[in-house]
Interface confidence: low
């Protein structure tokens, strides 16, 4: 289905020279930014945008990649390497460290330098780094963190926790051995090593003592506390704050962002991570576009501004399990989250990144036609005889022999929110990938986002887009902070 | 901002009745139970009640039951512990407290409860 203006070169031309004129306006602004948003869209590789946005435009008829996603909207666009110091491809923890805190580390640690070594914890004293959202708060920011993850996932974890293994959620988690180290649990630095306005997504289990059972599923005790050390956090978190609130379910989350007595919002929405988007229970647990606008109404009081960091998580999830439909719905949400920023934020001093800590072994291809369903066949057969997907995972546990060949496909079971998309080389899950992913910018600095990029440049652009340590003589007019 | 307010305690001779009240305020008694906790001089804390509106049960301790039943007024987000056949070794603080679990389980544990009121005096002279 080829629209008919787009067989006239005018149609083209116009177009093009529209995005020109766009581009010739624009003008790097030489003022400080008062908010930092960074956008972060785990495992968002370039070939899940280009999905997502097909995706987006053909569930609106479209016929899909002429449509914009909000990102697609920023003006300023870098490529971001995403290696870690000990590895090629990297994980959500290395990379978190780079991206928040502008210092690469080892794989599977989190706020540490490569000094640090993977689960040893008398590696970690003396190697912690600092990250851009500590600096935003001791600059008198106020701070939030919201994810479809739990809270004290790898990629928010960046933002407060040092640890040498992204796996110590709660103290159960950590070998005892660890413990009279004295490495701490990354919901207890949740809560102990800085002061966060805002704590928004998943990860209620690790908060309470063991037997202490979920409100939302009593009666499995699986989900239930986890803590070891008989200690509520949550409890200890509200006693820090005289507004303090803590909430579990999406009523009382909008409830709480109006009521202006709260200064301080802690939301777990479920013991683990969030559902995805397409299993939510709309009822109960809030969207990410939600838990994103709570945050802002909280954060945007403070007239010395805020730092956000927004992670749509579970777009990893889905490339993990080579779900595409999972990883592109979970996308589109993110997307929207943006989108939503956008509205209640000012370009004029609000700088937002829009990035990913790695991309996936995903692909699209196979010369589908245009308008096609993204999650549908490749027109023609493979060599085999069979149809083949146009979305496929290089590894991952969509590799299926039958009978010592590899299963024939319809367009009905590949367009199955369940479809596991093939793969060439079988996996319990399917890896990360390391080619180079994208920075997206809008707002005051966001001219410094070009080029090609080690991952850690966006923890530096925030730090002096803001004016924050080692930034702080950022000449740039009119300074952080003095807007109160 | 939450709130949970008990009223109705007081000096009563054994064998008599008296009602304690727990108000709430910045939520609804619909996602929490509600638990009466005492605490008497010199001894450790004892759950006494539960109430849930949501799984629409209750449950008390056994040092209470067939004495003590707890009942809610939706209209007025209240809670109410009417106690019969008050015995001196009833005497005690008592405090209500929103559980995070909807349905009372688990409500014996304090580590359970996300809010707590500041309590009321009940004495019971034999």
């Known amino acids: 289905i080829i629209p008919v203006e787009e067989e006239n070169p005018d149609f083209w031309n116009r177009q093009a020279a529209e995005a020109l004129g766009a581009a010739k306006k624009l003008q790097p602004a030489q003022t400080a930014a008062k908010n930092l948003i960074i956008f972060l869209g785990d495992g968002m590789g370039v070939s899940t945008v280009t999905a997502a946005r097909i995706l987006k435009g053909q569930k609106k008829d479209k016929l899909g990649p002429e449509t914009f996603l909000a990102m697609d909207r920023f003006p300023y666009v870098a490529l971001s390497k995403t290696y870690s110091v000990d590895k090629h491809v990297p994980d959500s923890g290395a990379t978190a460290t780079a991206y928040l805190c502008g210092v690469k580390g080892n794989f599977q640690t989190i706020g540490l330098s490569a000094a640090a070594r993977f689960n040893q914890c008398n590696t970690t004293r003396g190697n912690e780094v600092i990250s851009v959202m500590n600096r935003a708060k001791k600059a008198g920011k106020s701070v939030g963190v919201v994810t479809t993850t739990r809270v004290q996932h790898a990629s928010p974890a960046g933002a407060y926790a040092h640890t040498v293994n992204r796996n110590w959620y709660s103290d159960a988690d950590v070998p005892a051995s660890a413990r009279q180290e004295g490495c701490q649990d990354i919901a207890t630095q949740l809560i102990s090593n800085m002061d966060i306005d805002v704590i928004l997504g998943g990860g209620r289990k690790y908060m309470f003592p063991m037997g202490t059972p979920d409100p939302e599923y009593p009666d499995d005790y699986s989900q239930g506390g986890t803590r070891l050390d008989g200690k509520n956090l949550v409890q200890e978190w509200l006693a820090k704050h005289q507004g303090a609130r803590y909430v579990w379910n999406r009523t009382e989350l909008l409830q709480a962002s109006l009521d202006p007595s709260v200064t301080h919002l802690m939301g777990l929405f479920e013991p683990g991570d969030m559902k995805y988007e397409i299993h939510r229970d709309s009822t109960l647990d809030p969207s990410l576009m939600e838990m994103t606008e709570a945050a802002l109404l909280l954060l945007s009081r403070n007239p010395r501004g805020f730092f956000l960091f927004v992670e749509g998580g579970r777009i990893d999830h889905g490339h993990h399990e080579s779900r595409a439909y999972r990883a592109l719905t979970e996308t589109i949400m993110f997307d929207d989250a943006i989108e939503r920023a956008g509205q209640l934020t000012s370009e004029e001093d609000t700088l937002s990144l829009v990035t990913a800590d790695h991309s996936h072994v995903f692909s699209f291809g196979g010369y589908p036609l245009r308008g096609s369903s993204i999650f549908g066949l490749a027109p023609g057969k493979a060599r085999d005889r069979k149809a083949y997907t146009v979305l496929l995972y290089g590894n991952g546990p969509g590799y299926v022999l039958k009978d010592g060949a590899r299963p024939d496909v319809t367009e009905s079971e590949s367009g199955s929110p369940e479809y596991r998309q093939q793969s060439a080389v079988p996996l319990d899950g399917e890896t990360h990938a390391g080619e180079d992913v994208a920075v997206f910018a809008r707002g005051p600095q966001a001219h410094l986002v070009h080029g090609v990029q080690e991952q850690t440049f966006i923890a530096h652009v925030m730090a002096f887009a803001a004016c924050l340590e080692p930034y702080t003589a950022c000449d740039l007019a009119p300074r952080a902070g003095t807007t109160d | 901002q939450v709130q949970l307010v008990e009223s109705g305690g007081g000096l009563v001779q054994a064998g008599a009745s008296l009602t304690l009240s727990c108000a709430a305020s910045?939520?609804?008694?619909?996602?929490?139970?509600i638990v009466w906790f005492r605490q008497a001089p010199g001894k450790e804390r004892e759950a006494v009640s539960c109430?849930?509106?949501?799984?629409?049960?209750?449950y008390y301790g056994d040092s209470v039951q067939g004495r003590f039943s707890s009942s809610t007024d939706n209209a007025k987000n209240t809670v109410s512990l009417q106690m019969n056949s008050l015995k001196p070794e009833d005497t005690a603080v008592y405090t209500c407290?929103?559980?995070?679990?909807?349905?009372?389980?688990?409500?014996?544990?304090?580590?359970?409860?996300?809010?707590w009121g500041e309590g009321t005096m009940v004495t019971v002279s034999s």
């Open positions: 109430i849930s509106k949501v799984a629409g049960s209750t």
């Open positions: 910045g939520f609804t008694f619909n996602t929490r139970s």
């Open positions: 407290a929103a559980s995070f679990a909807p349905n009372c389980y688990g409500w014996s544990v304090a580590a359970n409860m996300e809010y």
